[in-house]
Interface confidence: low
């Protein structure tokens, strides 16, 4: 049997060395001369030569101080042998435990902690958590840590608390105001021995940044503004308004959104934000007319891009201001309004016939006196214009059916000028009233009838005059020869068309058929139709094949 039990020694022992630990004893020493020896870590393994045993006495010694944080314990093996090498005893495992001394300071995991929270947050809001480690023996007072805040900059009032065992920092006030202070610096402490005054302690820094919330409304620096703009100007900036907002610059909590609340029913204005300066830029986007309104009063409002954060705020969530816009008169010269004016004249009116013309006026006086007129364009030179009155006179016969006339209206362009030389232009539309000066006629003079698949063709007449001087038309075969009457029949099918059909089986060939068309007032014209009777299925097949009964392709009667 071995005598020793596990022994211990204090780390960092001051000695004196060699330091006696205990005596190893074997019962076999009563019967034998016993030599004691040891092996293992701290003896013949690293850290070498830390322990030794006296061969004869079994006294166990330590030669130098030990750091528990490096070696918690040593398991060495003790041997009992006789001088001749006989081992009457089994080797003894011997544990030497190194007892902890509070020789390590707790250390924060970070030199500086940085946390961010929003201003105005509720009491008890978690800011963040700090943590420290201690190399001394776990689950002992040497590693039982307590956290605390020992300083705050700016110092007053105390706004944060720290949980002593978890290191969690929370707010103790809801009065965090970024606009007043946007950063706090805490000095924090951790102490072992459960925070008792003799425990080892370390400090660190914790920076708490206060983030902005939109708790300030943008407010106009003035409640009323006066500006002016010349009438008829457009796309111009007429005013810049400024706002104050204590929230964080260049964020959605600070950026302003302007709006026109009242007075812009006609859409003359718009207000936009200058992204660089945050000013409201009031612009005219539709021209103003001094003669209509000399002053306009706008109400403008401003909010932030971000919604306002204060619930149940007693204040309205929008600052407003009034803008008085004085419209300045511009000496505009004559106004051609409406730009298109019309008069009525009979076509074929006699040369020298006069009519009212284009009228321009001075917008300041609403009067036309003193305005001079001149033709700018007159496509066919049919009229002249009176310089003083603007009235027109027929210079050449007016023809409603001329090619230059569209929809019976003849347009001339007029330049009006005042005594100061300012001008405007307008269009005078002369509505030409129709007279029955055109006969109806048949525009399609060539007709192909495929025989025998077709027995007739439709003949359509037109009259350039107004409908009142046009259809219904009267169609008739115009011929003194009985041959035409024998070969052809003509029958009206509506007001503007008739059906021409052949009879008595005429031969293939070309025929001239004269047709008279009369309008409702009896004005008439004769159109000679070229009618081809062809051996074909469709008109496109016709290659003018002549009837073999009449020999060579001569022109038939009436041509």
């Amino acid at each position: 049997r071995w005598a020793p039990i596990p022994c211990s020694m204090l780390e960092n022992s001051l000695g004196p060395f060699p330091l006696f630990l205990q005596q190893v004893q074997s019962d076999t020493a009563q019967n034998y001369t016993i030599y004691y020896s040891i092996r293992g870590p701290g003896v013949d393994q690293e850290p070498r030569n830390l322990f030794y045993v006296e061969r004869d006495t079994g006294n166990l010694y330590c030669t130098r101080p030990v750091d528990r944080e490096q070696y918690e314990s040593f398991e060495i093996i003790a041997f009992a042998t006789t001088p001749d090498g006989y081992t009457p005893e089994l080797p003894l495992p011997l544990i030497i435990k190194i007892e902890d001394e509070n020789d390590n300071y707790p250390i924060f995991t970070e030199e500086t902690y940085t946390f961010t929270i929003f201003e105005n947050c509720r009491v008890g809001t978690t800011v963040g958590q700090v943590c420290a480690t201690d190399k001394d023996e776990p689950d002992t007072m040497h590693t039982r840590l307590k956290y605390s805040i020992i300083g705050q900059v700016p110092p007053s009032p105390t706004l944060f608390s720290m949980h002593p065992t978890t290191g969690v920092i929370t707010t103790t006030s809801s009065q965090l105001d970024r606009e007043l202070i946007d950063k706090y610096q805490l000095k924090i402490k951790v102490q072992d021995m459960d925070g008792q005054y003799f425990g080892l302690q370390t400090t660190s820094t914790c920076i708490i940044n206060i983030d902005d919330v939109n708790d300030h409304l943008p407010t106009f620096t003035r409640t009323s503004y006066v500006t002016s703009v010349e009438e008829n100007t457009v796309d111009v900036e007429i005013l810049r308004v400024t706002v104050e907002d204590k929230d964080l610059v260049n964020t959605a909590n600070w950026r302003a959104n302007y709006t026109i609340l009242k007075g812009n029913e006609n859409g003359n204005f718009k207000i936009v934000t200058d992204a660089k300066t945050n000013e409201g830029v009031l612009c005219v986007v539709k021209p103003l007319n001094y003669e209509e309104k000399q002053q306009m009063i706008l109400q403008i409002g401003v909010v932030n891009e971000a919604p306002f954060s204060r619930e149940a705020s007693p204040r309205s969530a929008m600052s407003t201001a009034t803008v008085t816009v004085n419209v300045e008169d511009q000496d505009e010269g004559p106004e051609c309004n409406p730009p298109i004016q019309t008069v009525r004249m009979k076509e074929n009116a006699e040369v020298g016939t006069t009519s009212n013309g284009y009228k321009a006026y001075d917008p300041e006086t609403r009067s036309s006196s003193g305005i001079r007129y001149k033709k700018l364009t007159d496509p066919t030179g049919w009229v002249t214009i009176d310089e003083n009155t603007g009235s027109i006179k027929v210079f050449r016969s007016l023809d409603r059916e001329a090619e230059t006339i569209k929809n019976g209206i003849y347009n001339i362009t007029v330049l009006a000028s005042d005594q100061g030389g300012r001008t405007c232009t307008g269009t005078l539309g002369i509505i030409l009233q129709d007279v029955n000066d055109n006969s109806p006629f048949i525009p399609k003079k060539t007709v192909i009838i495929c025989k025998p698949t077709m027995s007739s063709a439709e003949i359509v007449a037109v009259d350039p005059d107004e409908p009142i001087h046009g259809p219904p038309f009267d169609f008739s075969l115009e011929s003194s020869t009985s041959e035409v009457q024998r070969m052809w029949r003509l029958k009206a099918i509506n007001d503007t068309a008739a059906r021409l059909s052949y009879q008595n089986d005429p031969p293939f060939g070309s025929y001239v058929v004269p047709i008279t068309v009369r309008d409702r007032l009896g004005m008439s014209s004769v159109t000679s139709l070229d009618v081809t009777l062809c051996d074909c299925i469709t008109e496109n097949d016709c290659t003018h094949r002549v009837d073999p009964r009449i020999g060579g392709g001569g022109v038939q009667l009436g041509k």
């Epitope: 946007d182 400024t242 104050e244 204590k246 964080l248 610059v249 300066t277």
Partner: antibody
């Protein structure tokens, strides 16, 4: 009424240091960015440094970068300019100015710094 | 960096007359220019910002215009208290003053 009062100027030897202060009143100091601007004798105005309302943004002119430090204490309504490694060409009247959006709308009367041996 | 070239560097004029000062930027500054009046022993005084917007309390004798790189500043009906040095300031990208014009 907005008021800015600079102090801390005086005679400094080349290589020396000096800290200028600017006391602000009459407005919410913590809502406005601030500048330092200087004017050397017989020369024009030269922008030196800028600090935003919450100190989150700072800019320096190339001529002072690495030698000057701008800072502010919002609760005390005070702006600072810490100047080190001073040179004779830093001799000037130093003004602090308030930023209204991006331009300077109010200026102090200035404090004179002379760098000479 | 943006450079501001201000001219002339000095000028004389008669009371009641008109003067014009110009500033040319080394690049487009998007109308972000301000004009200051500086008298000895005082801090500069803001007259105009954003090219042509007059500060409250500044008489309408002072005016500004321009766009792109070219800007001008005028004083009409000159009065004795207008004797000063005038500076332009660009604030489109950081801040640069013109060299000044002594009136």
């Amino acid at each position: 009424d907005v008021q800015l009062v600079e102090s801390g100027g005086g005679l400094v030897q080349p290589g020396g240091s000096r800290k200028l202060s600017c006391a602000a009143s009459g407005f919410t100091f913590s809502s406005f960015g601030m500048h330092w601007v200087r004017q050397a004798p017989e020369k024009g105005l030269e922008w030196v440094a800028y600090i935003s309302s919450g100190s989150s943004t700072i800019y320096y002119a190339d001529t002072v970068k690495g030698r000057f430090t701008i800072s502010r204490d919002n609760p005390k309504n005070t702006l600072f300019l810490q100047m080190t490694s001073l040179r004779s060409e830093d001799t000037a009247m130093y003004y602090c100015a308030r930023v209204h959006y991006y331009y300077f709308d109010y200026w102090g009367q200035g404090t004179t710094l002379t760098v000479s041996s | 960096d943006i450079q501001m070239t201000q001219s002339p560097s000095s000028l004389s004029a008669s009371l009641g007359g008109k003067v014009t000062i110009t500033c040319k930027a080394s690049q487009d500054i998007n109308k972000y220019i301000a004009w200051y009046q500086h008298k000895p022993g005082k801090g500069p005084r803001l007259l105009i910002h954003y090219t042509s917007t007059l500060q409250p309390g500044i008489p309408s004798r002072f005016s500004g215009s321009g766009s792109g790189r070219d800007y001008s500043f005028s004083i009409s009906n000159l009065e004795p208290e207008d004797i000063a040095t005038y500076y332009c300031l660009q604030y489109d990208n950081l801040w640069t003053f013109g060299g000044g014009t002594k009136l």
